[in-house]
């Protein structure tokens, strides 16, 4: 097992993830592991010397960087909130705040916007990827209603008048609940279906 530093005539190293080619000395040297940086470069007689990243800084990968990356907070102006804090090995993890979706992606989400309202008679389709896309409004299924403009309101089942000992006065629609009345209440004239012969 050859350990760094070792000579390399073809400018390639055995383990590209954990080693790098140093052209000045024509040798392969160790990279520094995640959470560390190069505090002293390698030479023919000594391998790379690594040091731990200072507080509020990180390096995610095996590297030969002479500095660590500065931790950045999740930007609330962009609608982002923290999932997990920055450590020496990873940057701050962010997501969209509740009621928002990711409107702009780089490698990660960079900008969140408010979810669109779903109009009466519809509801937001439930997604696996909550917050990663805007609402897609779908009609309430039969026997259900939703009577507000809202990004999160769910369609509710129509009231069953008979369950309450009442009778239906007006049927429910996608935008309104069933109207019930007492069986003893007389129907208004326009709703009376009785014809005298």
């Amino acid at each position: 097992q050859v350990v760094p530093p070792y000579g390399s005539e073809n400018q390639t190293c055995r383990d590209q993830e954990k080693e790098y080619y140093e052209p000045r000395h024509r040798i392969c040297c160790s990279r520094c592991p995640p959470g560390t940086y190069v505090s002293a470069k390698c030479s023919r007689s000594r391998d790379t010397v690594c040091a731990t990243c200072a507080e509020n800084s990180y390096n995610e990968h095996w590297n030969y960087l002479t500095i660590c990356q500065l931790c950045r907070p999740c930007d609330p102006v962009m609608g982002l909130e923290e999932i997990a804090p920055c450590t020496s090995k990873r940057k701050t993890q962010c997501r969209c705040q509740p009621g928002m979706f990711c409107a702009a992606w780089a490698l990660e989400c960079t900008h969140c916007e408010l979810l669109s309202d779903c109009p009466p008679g519809t509801e937001a389709e439930l997604k696996d990827e909550v917050g990663k896309g805007n609402n897609h409004c779908v009609p309430c299924k039969a026997g259900h209603f939703q009577n507000t403009s809202s990004p999160s309101a769910r369609c509710q089942p129509h009231t069953r008048c008979e369950d309450q000992g009442l009778v239906e006065a007006a049927p429910g629609t996608a935008q309104s609940d069933t109207t019930c009345r007492n069986p003893s209440e007389s129907l208004p004239p326009e709703m009376s279906g009785t014809m005298l012969m």
Epitope: R90, Q93, C94, W105, C109, D128, K132, G133
Partner: nanobody, 120 residues
Framework: EVQLVESGGGLVQPGGSLRLSCAAS????????MAWFRQAPGKEREAVAA????????YYADSVKGRFTISRDNAKNTVYLQMNSLRPEDTAVYYC?????????????WGQGTLVTVSS
């Protein structure tokens, strides 16, 4: 535990094409943001492209825009990187990575990598 296995690397001439595949197993990947990274000899690891599992939120590094395309096939739990008009500077080990939170701020699962060499 999640496993990512890359394939499709190899030797190609400048101007040629390759398609890399990343097969994911061990869990449902519905919520995962997937990405391709690469590490060229003597360089730091860099992100090349990323995609959400609904196909949205795609990202490309400036150096590959218009030449590389990331896509996914949910039925096969596989992510692809179509690489066209390859250049010698695209020579690198290409790694597939998954972010289990889906937000792309920390890729916690990695494949072993597949070597792409662009040379005449």
């Amino acid at each position: 535990e999640v496993q990512l296995v890359e394939s499709g690397g190899g030797l190609v001439q400048p101007g040629g094409s390759l398609r890399l595949s990343c097969a994911a197993s061990g869990r449902t990947f519905t919520n995962y943001r997937m990405a391709w990274f690469r590490q060229a000899p003597g360089k730091e690891r860099e992100a090349v492209a990323a995609i959400n599992w609904n196909g949205g939120g795609t990202y490309y590094a400036d150096s590959v825009k218009g030449r590389f395309t990331i896509s996914r096939d949910n039925a096969k739990n596989t992510v692809y990187l179509q690489m066209n008009s390859l250049r010698p500077e695209d020579t690198a080990v290409y790694y597939c990575a998954a972010d289990s939170t889906g937000w792309g701020s920390y890729f916690d699962y990695w494949g072993q990598g597949t070597l792409v060499t662009v040379s005449s």
